[in-house]
């Protein structure tokens, strides 16, 4: 039995930041789980990990240097990413593993989300000047 994952097909990261919501066909309440976000068609880069084990507090980390945070819903985990670069535009896949209670469960590979990173340091057009930071 596999958990199904729904993601937005595409998101635009303005200001180098984005929120990506992973929706699962499984209630994570009172479960020990590891939710992760992976970059690339081959999911080669593990961008962010959100670990939950019954307590109220999620443990969030990245072994690949991404600035991330996570929020838990009953059947979702939202990944918040900051400081993205334009060249990190790519497809991102949500993954979920439920370790406890048995049986161990993971997900069918989702369709992924293309995150298009629009840099904030763009040259403003003369007709539409961008906001200036004080």
């Amino acid at each position: 039995n596999k958990i199904l994952v729904k993601q937005s097909p595409m998101l635009v990261a303005y200001d180098n930041a984005v929120n990506l919501s992973c929706k699962y066909s499984y209630n994570l309440f009172s479960r020990e789980f590891r939710a992760s976000l992976h970059k690339g068609l081959d999911s080669a880069v593990e961008v962010c990990v959100v670990y939950g084990n019954y307590s109220q507090q999620l443990q969030v980390y990245s072994k690949t240097g991404f600035n991330c945070d996570g929020k838990l819903g009953n059947e979702s985990v939202t990944f918040y990413l900051q400081n993205l670069y334009v060249n990190q535009t790519d497809i991102y896949f949500c993954k979920i593993e439920v370790m406890y209670p048995p049986p161990y469960l993971d997900n069918e590979k989702s369709n992924g989300t293309i995150i298009h990173v629009k840099g904030k340091h763009l040259c403003p057009s003369p007709l539409f000047p961008g906001p200036s930071k004080p």
Partner: antibody, heavy 120, light 107 residues
Framework: EVQLVESGGGLVQPGGSLRLSCAAS????????MHWVRQAPGKGLVWVSR????????SHADSVKGRFTISRDNAKNTLYLQVNGLRAEDTAVYYC?????????????WGQGTLVTVSS | EIVLTQSPATLSLSPGERATLSCRAS??????LAWYQQKPGQAPRLLIY???NRATGIPARFSGSGSGTDFTLTISSLEPEDFAVYYC?????????FGQGTKVEIK
């Protein structure tokens, strides 16, 4: 005026535990990410742990993962760091620091620190 | 993790002189670099954020510049109270990291 006041440090034996506290005032505590940063005697600054504004998520440096736990009580405007399995290399002044919830890891105000000494 | 290397380790100058402190990152941190001042027995104080923005209440003699991997903190004319240790810190990549510090001492 923003104030952060740490307490709970002291002398502890290797393997021992302490709970550090940071009492906050002068700002809306529940709107900010909070951090612990430490400084070994005569050394530089090292980030230890963070907690988001509502306490629902946390991150820890690899060197303390599994031993240190960060928490907060927004009703009491207090940040905590539970430190277990202390080692000699954890000897340091522990500072709590505030970070805006939009810039996560930019520390705009710091407490005066509390000294943790791990020695037998 | 990103390594920040500060130079020089110690800068010996007289009041009124210009101080130039360098911070180099092992990989690009965009403009997400801050500078802190720490005096003996005191907590660090934020001086500059996002490479070039002065924090609230910081005098105009402090300025920051740079992006990518190379950053500079300049104190245009040293005041007696500016003799301290200065740290750079990046928040572009997790985990956040600090440089080892530059001590500005009285010559």
């Amino acid at each position: 005026e923003v104030q952060l006041v740490e307490s709970g440090g002291g002398l502890v034996q290797p393997g021992g535990s302490l709970r550090l506290s940071c009492a906050a005032s002068g700002f809306t505590f529940s709107s900010y990410w909070m951090h612990w940063v430490r400084q070994a005697p005569g050394k530089g600054l090292v980030w230890v742990s963070r907690i988001n504004s509502d306490g629902s998520s946390a991150s820890h440096a690899d060197s303390v993962k599994g031993r240190f736990t960060i928490s907060r009580d927004n009703a009491k405007n207090t940040l905590y760091l539970q430190v277990n399995g202390l080692r000699a290399e954890d000897t340091a002044v522990y500072y709590c620091a505030r970070a805006d919830s939009s810039s996560w890891y930019e520390f705009d105000f710091w407490g005066q620190g509390t000294l943790v000494t791990v020695s037998s | 993790e990103i390594v920040l290397t500060q130079s020089p380790a110690t800068l010996s100058l007289s009041p009124g002189e210009r101080a130039t402190l360098s911070c180099r990152a092992s990989q690009s941190v965009s403009s997400y670099l801050a500078w802190y001042q720490q005096k003996p027995g005191q907590a660090p104080r934020l001086l500059i954020y996002d490479a070039s923005n002065r924090a609230t209440g910081i005098p105009a003699r402090f300025s920051g510049s740079g992006s990518g991997t190379d950053f500079t903190l300049t104190i245009s004319s040293l005041e007696p109270e500016d003799f301290a240790v200065y740290y750079c810190q990046q928040r572009n990549n997790w985990p956040p990291t600090f440089g080892q510090g530059t001590k500005v001492e009285i010559k």
